[in-house]
């Protein structure tokens, strides 16, 4: 008796144990997108970056969707999001057009049910790059701690696209849940 | 024959908790890890910096390993990683041999198993820091969520080491375990 | 006897999980404040912003307190840090009293046991804003990992606090609890 | 080989002015930063002004500050030194050095010129 | 600024001897930025070391130099007879660069 019900019990707190890693694991969805350079479009308007990497290099995705230019929200939670964006020029890609540039970033969070987009962070700088330097660079980083629910669309706006650094380790976002909503 | 069922199964679930409590805090590894200016190298060129504080101030690790100037991952697992660099100069630093500085990190991972290294972010920007101003700064911040197996390596390069901000606030990077690999 | 035993258990593994969800939750603080633009003080120096939202649009609070423009602890823990802080100032604003600014965020952290203030992480840049220029913005994002104690108070010092970005998605800082203290 | 070749002293009066050069070859002048370094008779070492690669930033020590100028012709790969209100304690041979540029920060004088000599009396 | 006071004024050795040339800092040496040169009658110095104790191209090893802080020495295993000159220690880790008044090592 005592002995198949301890069993029994192992048995149990098994799969249970199971369930809860399992379950962990999730509610744990995250993304990691690079930079699909093939793709950037050129003009120095804001514009949406639609191509993204979501599976190769450091790329990579779970319980998340990437779908049309847009990471989607597959479970309700509080996420960290994050954005690195790197712009840079040689002047072997020709000369600016002008020097006074505005290098920016925002990370908007659309909702179909009620189609409205809202920038959730924003980050940048104006700069002066001057034709006495042959080579300029500059990063942007934000990050911040969000509720998203289900079906919500994460997207990435800049500036000056065709001055966007092309590399995995320069031009990427993500994200990763961090707890589920009360 | 209930009670006693009851009292055991208290017992074994309480274990249970303890057991999950402990593991849910092995399996988060983490480490802050400050510049520690005495060691700094000079020169202008991309130079790994191999002198971190991991015990005192701000800084701290738990496990990870910090060995050879490296943050080195004891647990599979996904982590978000970070570095915030900070350079500075003020004119009785000495005269800038030139106002057109790059000011860059490199967040690298190496693995021992097939050696190699690779820029897993990088961030930073062209200054024009002119003599006619008494003090510069600027700060680069990085962060990015990435798969971590054990025995890989992670390192910090900068341009310019000479010119780092040697608090424990301004220069510094690290690492925190967010979920395990499926 | 069998069957009776399964349904308790049952019941008290149902229970458990309630509790490990219920306590899984509760273990994870957060806040997510985003600037007050009523009440931001003016001048170049460096200054406590003390008036920030935390329940309208991105802005939330959970298990933590926000009081006289702290955030404060309520659990001890490992928290993620960050802080988003936007500066920009447009012609039609005035002219700027210098070209060279220093613009800086200091995130602070103060124990009320031992009265005492310490920088966890710095971030910023010195710029040339030239008249030429009708319009300026720079952004600066620090984040880190840091150990909290219960009723320590986490608060943000900026220089230049005329010339912050009032909007949510600009200057805003937060935190999210990782992990409990050994 | 670099070579560093400095002209242009001589005696003048107190008051006076001068204008000192020095012709750089065998390196890409303009990647480098340069200095003027000088000593007295029987003296020792005084740095006494340097300019950064692009000419934009220029750097001088107390003692010559408001009366001397620095500059550089990158076409010409040639440095100068302007002095004017020129004293009696500023009579020293003059060296053009050649910043090393392994550094951002002006640092070690290597090589120098075989300097020229200023002498500053009535 | 940083004042740098060599010591002794004068050395005399014999060839083949070792010199050991101190230079002080008023105030600490950032990041070993410390260089020594070498001047003969009638010539322009020449760099021996810089950062302290990395030997410049072309000099022989006999040279040396070390310390950080305050304090800093040039040493010369074994002095040949071309050696003889003065020396003089140069700092660049704060404006103005400065040099020390000179050490001559004379021989005896």
């Known amino acids: 008796g005592s002995q198949h019900i301890r069993a029994e019990k192992a048995m149990v707190d098994g799969s249970w144990l199971d369930l809860a890693k399992r379950s962990k694991l999730e509610a744990q969805p995250f993304a990691h997108l690079t930079i699909n350079a093939t793709d950037i479009p050129s003009g120095s308007h804001k514009v949406s970056l639609s191509s993204w990497y979501h599976d190769r290099g450091w790329a990579k995705i779970s319980n998340m969707t990437f779908s049309n230019g847009k990471l989607i929200v597959n479970q309700d939670g509080f996420y960290y999001l994050y954005a690195n964006i790197c712009f840079r020029h040689h002047e072997t890609s020709g000369d600016l057009a002008t020097e006074y540039l505005q290098l920016m970033v925002y990370v908007t969070k659309t909702s179909i049910k009620i189609p409205s987009s809202h920038t959730l962070m924003k980050g940048g700088s104006t700069k002066y790059w001057s034709g006495n330097s042959e080579f300029h660079f500059y990063s942007i980083n934000v990050g911040g701690f969000f509720k998203l629910r289900s079906g919500e669309e994460i997207s990435i706006e800049v500036s000056n696209p065709s001055l966007l650094d092309p590399d995995q380790d320069a031009t990427y976002f993500g994200a990763f849940k961090v707890r589920d909503i009360d | 024959g209930s009670q006693h069922i009851r009292a055991e199964k208290a017992m074994v679930d309480g274990s249970w908790l303890d057991l999950a409590k402990r593991s849910k805090l092995e399996a988060q590894p983490f480490a802050h890890l400050t510049i520690n200016a005495t060691d700094i190298p000079s020169g202008s060129h991309k130079v790994s910096l191999s002198s971190w504080y991991h015990d005192r101030g701000w800084a701290k690790i738990s496990n990870m390993t910090f060995s050879n100037g490296k943050l080195i991952v004891n647990q599979d697992g996904f982590y978000y990683l970070y570095a915030n660099i900070c350079f500075r100069h003020h004119e009785t630093s000495g005269d800038l041999a030139t106002e057109y500085l790059q000011l860059m990190v490199y967040v690298t991972k190496t693995s021992i198993k097939i050696p190699s290294s690779h820029t897993l972010m990088k961030g930073g920007s062209t200054k024009y820091w002119s003599g006619n101003s008494e003090f510069h700064f600027y700060s680069i911040n990085v962060g990015g969520f990435f798969k971590l197996r054990s025995g890989e390596e992670i390192s910090i390069e900068v341009s310019n080491p000479s010119l780092l901000d040697p608090d424990q606030d301004a220069t510094y990077f690290g690492a925190f375990k967010v979920r395990d690999i499926d | 006897g069998s069957q009776h035993i399964r349904a308790e258990k049952a019941m008290v593994d149902g229970s458990w999980l309630d509790l490990a969800k219920r306590s899984k939750l509760e273990a994870q603080p957060f806040a997510h404040l985003t600037i007050n633009a009523t009440d931001i003080p003016s001048g170049s120096h460096k200054v406590s912003l003390s008036s920030w939202y935390h329940d309208r649009g991105w802005a939330k609070i959970s298990n933590m307190t926000f009081s006289n423009g702290k955030l404060i602890v309520n659990q001890d823990g490992f928290y993620y840090l960050y802080a988003n802080i936007c500066f920009r100032h447009h012609e039609t604003s005035g002219d700027l009293a210098t070209e060279y600014l220093q613009l800086m965020v200091y995130v602070t952290k103060t124990s009320i046991k031992i009265p005492s203030s310490h920088t966890l992480m710095k971030g910023g840049s010195t710029k040339y804003w030239s008249g030429n220029s009708e319009f300026h913005f720079y952004s600066i994002n620090v984040g880190g990992f840091f150990k909290l104690r219960s009723g320590e108070e986490i608060s943000i010092e900026v220089s230049n606090p005329s010339l912050l970005d009032p909007d949510q998605d600009a200057t805003y800082f937060g935190a999210f609890k990782v992990r409990d203290i050994d | 080989e670099v070579q560093l070749l400095e002209s242009g002293g001589g005696l003048v009066q107190p008051g006076g002015s001068l204008r000192l050069s020095c012709a750089a070859s065998?390196?890409?002048?303009?990647?480098?930063?340069m200095s003027w370094v000088r000593q007295a008779p029987g003296k020792g070492l005084e740095w006494v002004s340097g300019i950064t690669g692009s000419g934009g930033s220029t750097y001088y020590a107390d003692s010559v500050k408001g009366r001397f100028t620095i500059s550089r012709d990158n076409s010409k790969n040639t440095l100068y030194l302007q002095m004017n209100s020129l004293r009696a304690e500023d009579t020293a041979v003059y060296y053009c050095a050649k910043d090393p540029g392994t550094t951002v920060i002006m640092s070690w004088f290597d090589p120098w010129g075989q300097g020229t000599l200023v002498t500053v009396s009535s | 600024e940083i004042v740098l006071t060599q010591s002794p004024g004068t050395l005399s050795l014999s060839p083949g001897e070792r010199a050991t040339l101190s230079c002080r800092a008023s105030q600490s040496v950032r990041g070993r930025y410390l260089a020594w040169y070498q001047q003969k009658p009638g010539q322009a110095p020449r760099l021996l070391i810089y950062g302290s104790s990395s030997r410049a191209t072309g000099i022989p090893d006999r040279f040396s130099g070390s310390g950080s802080g305050t304090d800093f020495t040039l040493t010369i295993s074994r002095l040949e007879p071309e050696d003889f000159a003065v020396f003089y220690c140069q700092q660049y880790g704060s404006s103005p660069r400065t040099f020390g008044q000179g050490t001559k090592v004379e021989i005896k």
């Open positions: 065998g390196f890409t002048f303009s990647s480098y930063a």
